[in-house]
C-alpha cells in the first residue's frame, strides 16, 4: 500500500502547523474537514511557509493533487495580481508567494475554480474545478505557542506520542502545538502524560518537567493522580483536583459534580451538595424544585411594550397592531410609515448576480430545505448609525503573518485570560457592531453551506468593529490559552431609548472569551440545538399584562438598544414590528450572557439537522439545549436589511450566500 | 507517444468470465489513474471504474459491483480487468482509456487518451 | 448517480453552419464536464475538458462553455470531417462517472 497515501501527517512550527490528509474529498469537503478540526485550508503566504509544506508533502506521485486554501469566483479573473483573482478562504488577497503551473493566461474565467498542489516536483499549483475530487488536502493550524518535542531519556521505553489537538497522533514531530499530549512510556512500566500548556510566567511549556521517567513519587505517572499531585513531607503522595472537581472514592480520579447534577438548565460546582443549580436569564428556579426552572412572563411586567406582548418561553416580543410599526427600540409603536428603510431586495441581487443559471439556483434552493442553522464565528449587530457595512473574520494564523484586517485594530485592552467569576447573567448595551470570531470555529453541517468572507473596505475609525478571538475552546480551563479581547467603548448611551433584556439559553464557552460566565469544557465538543418558532407557528399576541401561555421552547429574542432586525411571525398579517424586509420567527435572534460591556447577537437561522454541531456551545457543559422543533415545509426565505449607503460596498459574506432575499445555495463561495 | 491497447478473446460464453488486458506505452504508467468504459453496439459508452497503477485504488460503478475486478501489473505497464456471470447484455467494445492529470496549468480528470476498444461477444 | 441528459439526439446540418449540442447534469458538477468525438468504428477522442478548455490539438471551431448543471458545445463551422456523434461527460468522482446519450451529428 502507498505510503504516501496511508496516514495524515503533520509539520508544525512554533506557531502553526501544516497537516497533509490523504483523503479524497472535494474542496468544499476538505475545507470542511480543515475546519472541523479547527484549523484552515492551507494557505502558504510566503516561501518560507511553502518550504514547510513542501518538506511536508515530500516526493509523491505526478497523479497526486492536494487542495490548498484558494479560490476563485466566476469572471473574478486578475490576472496582472498575483493570486489571478484568487482568494484564500481566509478571506483576503495577501501573499509573499506564488507558484503557478503555468503562466497566466488571458481569458474569461467563466467558471468558480479552486487550486490544488501537485504531490510531485515542485509542488506547482494547479488551477481546476472544484467539485472534482483530489487525492487529498493541506490544512492549516495555528496557535499561540507550542513546545518543543521532549528530549528522549534513558529511562525511556521508546519514543514520545503526542497528540496534537488537530487529532493527529505521531512520534515525528519538532514542535507540540499548545494543546497537545506527550505520551512517555517508561521501561520500569509506568508512563507518564504531559500537556502543553500555558506557563504562568508567560509562554507555554510542558506541564512537567522532567525527566518522566525516574525517581518515585510524583514523578512516573503523575502518582497516579488524575489531575494534581501532592509529594507530602514523609515522602508519600496525595492527590488534589483542580477547582470544581472533587476527589473520587479512589483516592486518585477526579470526578465533576456536575456530571451527574439533576439541574435542568445549569450547574455549578460547589455548595453543600457539591454543586448547585441556576437558570438561564428569563427563568427562574421551581417553587417546588430548584432543580427546575420555569419560565417567567415579562409580559405580566408594566411596560414591558407599548401595545402588545407575546411570551415564548425563554423570551418575549414586542407588537404593534396594524397601521403601526415597532421602532427601533423594541418596545415602542409609531404610525406606519414613519421609519422607511432601505429594503435589501436589489442588494441580495446585485450580491448573488454572478450570471449562473438562476432557475436551476431555484431548484437547488428548494432541495436545500434544512435552512441556515450555524454561522461559524460571526456574530452580527446592526449599528445606531448605519455605517460603510464590514465584516471582520480572523482565521487562526502564524503570527508572524496575520492576515490584514480591513479596518485599523485597536489595541487595547491588554490581553485577559477566562477570569472564574459569580454566576449570573446580563445584558448590556452596545452601540456599534460586534464580531466575534473563533480561531477554531466549528464545521458546518453537511447541509450547509459555509461562508467565507471577502476583503471588504475598510471602516471608518467611528466604525470599527471589534474583535474577540478566541482559541481552542474545547481544553479544560487550566489550560486555556490566553484570550485575547480588544473593544472600543460604546458611545455614551444618553440619548437612547432603554433596553430591555430578553431571555434566551446561555450559548457560548465561557474561553471562547472573558466575557463569558465560567465554564469547564470536556475534552469533547457540545452539540447545542438552538430552537427556533415554527413559521407555521402565530404567536399569542395580548394586550399589555395579558396572561399568556408559552408558545415555543426557547424562543430566542433580542432587544438593545442598536437598531433591530424584525422579527415578525409569518401567520401575523394584522401585525408589523417594522418597515425593513422581514424575519420570521425561525430566524431570530439571541445573545449570550455578558459581564463585559457589549451585547453580541447571533444571527441564528433555526432548523438544525440532528446532531449538528452548533458553533455557538452552552456556557456550561452541563446545560441542557432544548431539541428544535422539526419543520417539513421550504425554509422561509430571509431578507437582510444591511444599513449601508452604498449596496456595492457591502460584504458577499453573508449577505451572498444565506441572507439575501434570492439567495440559494451553491457551491460559487464555499 | 502514448498508446493504450486492449486485447482479450472476442467470445465468451454466458456465466463465463471476461478478461481483458490493456497495455500502456508512451508514459510512466504509475502516473495516471486507467479507466474501464465499454459500448454496446449501436449505443452509447457505459463506464465500468477506474484504477490507479500508483497505489491499485479502485473505484466501480455500482452497476458492475460484485462482478469487477480491476488489476495492475506495474512491471509490465498492463491493466487487467475481470467481469464474471458475463451475460448476452454485456456484449460491447470494451475500451481502457487514460484519466488526464493536468494540461496548460489546469488539473483536470478527462480522459485523455483512449484504446482502440475490444470488441467482446458473449454467446454460447 | 449523477444524469447527464443530452440533445438533440440527432442532427443534420450544412457545411459551415454552427452546431449547437447541449447538456444538462442532473446535479451541480461543477465545471468537471468532458465533450468527447467519436467517428463510426473507432474509439472516443477528448475535445474539451474542464467544461471550456480546448484539448491540446483540437481545432478552434470547436468550444464549450458552461458551469454547474448546464452545459453547451458549440462547432462554429460544420466540416465534412466532424460527422460524428458527440457525447458529453462528466467527472467529478461522485458517485462515478457518467455518459450523456450521444448526439449523432450528419450532413445534409
Known amino acids: 500500500q502507498d505510503p504516501w497515501a496511508a496516514e495524515p501527517r503533520a509539520a508544525c512550527g512554533p506557531s502553526s502547523c501544516y497537516a497533509l490528509f490523504p483523503r479524497r474529498r472535494t474542496f468544499l469537503e476538505a475545507w470542511r474537514a480543515c475546519r472541523e478540526l479547527g484549523g484552515d485550508l492551507a494557505t502558504p503566504r510566503t516561501p518560507e511557509e511553502a518550504q514547510r509544506v513542501d518538506s511536508l508533502v515530500g516526493a509523491g506521485p505526478a497523479s497526486r493533487l492536494l487542495w490548498i486554501g484558494l479560490q476563485r469566483q466566476a469572471r473574478q479573473c486578475q490576472l496582472q495580481r498575483p493570486l489571478r483573482g484568487f482568494t484564500w478562504t481566509t478571506g483576503d488577497q495577501d501573499t509573499a508567494f506564488t507558484n503557478w503551473a503555468q503562466p497566466a493566461s488571458g481569458g474569461p474565467c467563466p467558471a468558480q475554480r479552486c487550486v490544488a498542489l501537485e504531490a510531485s516536483g515542485e509542488h506547482r499549483w494547479l488551477e481546476g474545478s472544484c467539485t472534482l475530487a483530489v487525492d487529498g488536502y493541506l490544512c492549516q493550524f495555528g496557535f499561540e505557542g507550542a513546545c518543543p518535542a521532549l528530549q528522549d531519556e534513558a529511562g525511556q521505553a521508546g519514543p514520545a506520542v503526542y497528540t496534537t489537538p488537530f487529532h493527529l497522533v505521531s512520534t515525528e514531530f519538532e514542535w507540540l502545538p499548545f494543546g497537545s499530549v506527550a505520551a512517555v512510556q517508561c521501561q520500569a512500566g509506568r508512563g507518564a502524560s504531559l500537556l502543553c500548556v500555558k506557563q504562568p510566567e508567560g509562554g507555554v511549556g510542558w506541564s512537567r518537567a522532567g525527566p518522566l521517567c525516574l525517581g518515585t513519587g510524583c514523578s512516573p505517572d503523575n502518582g497516579g493522580c488524575e489531575h494534581e499531585c501532592v509529594e507530602e513531607v514523609d515522602g508519600h503522595v496525595s492527590c488534589r483536583c483542580t477547582e470544581g472537581f472533587r476527589l473520587a472514592a479512589d483516592g486518585r480520579s477526579c470526578e465533576d459534580p456536575c456530571a451527574q447534577a439533576p439541574c435542568e438548565q445549569q450547574c455549578e460546582p460547589g455548595g453543600p451538595q457539591g454543586y448547585s443549580c441556576h437558570c438561564r436569564l428569563g427563568f427562574r428556579p421551581a417553587e417546588d424544585d430548584p432543580h427546575r426552572c420555569v419560565d417567567t412572563d415579562e409580559c405580566q411586567i408594566a411596560g414591558v411594550c407599548q401595545q402588545m406582548c407575546v411570551n415564548y418561553v425563554g423570551g418575549f416580543e414586542c407588537y404593534c397592531s396594524e397601521g403601526h410599526e415597532l421602532e427601533a427600540d423594541g418596545i415602542s409603536c409609531s404610525p406606519a410609515g414613519a421609519m422607511g428603510a432601505q429594503a435589501s431586495q436589489d442588494l441580495g441581487d446585485e450580491l448573488l448576480d454572478d450570471g449562473e443559471d438562476e432557475e436551476d439556483e431555484d431548484e437547488a434552493w428548494k432541495a436545500f430545505n434544512g435552512g441556515w442553522t450555524e454561522m461559524p464565528g460571526i456574530l452580527w449587530m446592526e449599528p445606531t448609525q448605519p455605517p460603510d457595512f464590514a465584516l471582520a473574520y480572523r482565521p487562526s494564523f502564524p503570527e508572524d503573518r496575520e492576515p490584514q484586517i480591513p479596518y485599523p485594530e485597536p489595541t487595547w485592552p491588554p490581553p485577559l485570560s477566562a477570569p472564574r467569576v459569580p454566576y449570573h447573567s446580563s445584558v448590556l448595551s452596545v452601540t456599534r457592531p460586534v464580531v466575534v470570531s473563533a480561531t477554531h470555529p466549528t464545521l458546518p453541517s453537511a447541509h450547509q453551506p459555509p461562508v467565507i468572507p471577502a476583503t471588504h473596505p475598510a471602516l471608518s475609525r467611528d466604525h470599527q468593529i471589534p474583535v474577540i478571538a478566541a482559541n481552542y475552546p474545547d481544553l479544560p480551563s487550566a489550560y486555556q490559552p490566553g484570550i485575547l479581547s480588544v473593544s472600543h467603548s460604546a458611545q455614551p448611551p444618553a440619548h437612547q431609548p432603554p433596553m430591555i433584556s430578553t431571555k434566551y439559553p446561555e450559548l457560548f464557552p465561557a474561553h471562547q472569551s472573558p466575557m463569558f460566565p465560567d465554564t469547564r469544557v470536556a475534552g469533547t465538543q457540545t452539540t447545542t440545538h438552538l430552537p427556533g418558532i415554527p413559521p407555521n407557528h402565530a404567536p399569542l399576541v395580548t394586550t399589555l399584562g395579558a396572561q399568556l401561555p408559552p408558545q415555543a421552547p426557547d424562543a430566542l429574542v433580542l432587544r438593545t438598544q442598536a437598531t433591530q432586525l424584525p422579527i415578525i411571525p409569518t401567520a401575523q398579517p394584522s401585525l408589523t414590528t417594522t418597515s425593513r424586509s422581514p424575519v420570521s420567527p425561525a430566524h431570530q435572534i439571541s445573545v449570550p450572557a455578558a459581564t463585559q460591556p457589549a451585547a453580541l447577537p447571533t444571527l441564528l437561522p433555526s432548523q438544525s439537522p440532528t446532531n449538528q454541531t452548533s458553533p455557538i456551545s452552552p456556557t456550561h457543559p452541563h446545560s441542557k439545549a432544548p431539541q428544535i422543533p422539526r419543520e417539513d415545509g421550504p425554509s422561509p426565505k430571509l431578507a437582510l436589511w444591511l444599513p449601508s449607503p452604498a449596496p456595492t460596498a457591502a460584504p458577499t459574506a453573508l449577505g451572498e450566500a444565506g441572507l439575501a432575499e434570492h439567495s440559494q445555495r451553491d457551491d460559487r463561495w464555499l | 507517444q502514448v498508446q493504450l491497447q486492449e486485447s482479450g478473446p472476442g467470445l465468451v460464453r454466458p456465466s463465463q468470465t471476461l478478461s481483458l488486458t490493456c497495455t500502456a506505452s508512451?508514459?510512466?504508467?504509475?502516473?495516471?489513474?486507467i479507466h474501464w468504459v465499454r459500448q454496446p453496439p449501436g449505443r452509447g459508452l457505459e463506464w465500468i471504474g477506474y484504477?490507479?497503477?500508483?497505489?491499485?485504488?479502485?473505484t466501480y460503478n455500482q452497476k458492475f459491483k460484485g462482478r469487477v475486478t480491476m488489476l495492475v501489473d506495474t512491471s509490465s505497464n498492463t491493466a487487467y480487468l475481470r467481469l464474471s456471470s458475463v451475460t448476452a447484455e454485456d456484449t460491447a467494445v470494451y475500451y481502457c482509456a487514460r484519466r488526464g492529470n493536468s494540461y496548460d496549468g489546469y488539473f483536470d480528470y478527462s480522459m485523455d487518451y483512449w484504446g482502440q476498444g475490444s470488441l467482446v461477444t458473449v454467446s454460447s | 448517480d449523477i444524469q447527464m441528459t443530452q440533445s438533440p439526439s440527432s442532427l443534420s446540418a450544412s457545411v459551415g453552419d454552427r452546431v449547437t449540442i447541449t447538456c444538462r447534469a442532473s446535479?451541480?458538477?461543477?465545471?468537471?464536464v468532458a465533450w468527447l468525438q467519436q467517428t463510426p468504428g473507432k474509439a472516443p477522442k477528448l475535445l474539451i475538458y474542464?467544461?471550456?478548455n480546448r484539448y491540446t490539438g483540437v481545432p478552434s471551431r470547436f468550444s464549450g462553455s458552461g458551469s454547474g448543471t448546464d452545459f453547451t458545445f458549440t462547432i462554429s463551422s460544420l466540416q465534412p470531417e466532424d460527422i460524428a456523434t458527440y457525447y458529453c461527460q462528466q467527472y467529478t468522482n461522485y458517485p462515478m462517472y457518467t455518459f450523456g446519450q450521444g448526439t449523432k451529428v450528419q450532413i445534409k
Open positions: 474542464s467544461a471550456s
Open positions: 508512451g508514459y510512466t504508467f504509475t502516473d495516471y489513474v
Open positions: 484504477i490507479n497503477p500508483y497505489d491499485d485504488d479502485t
Open positions: 446535479q451541480n458538477v461543477g465545471t468537471a
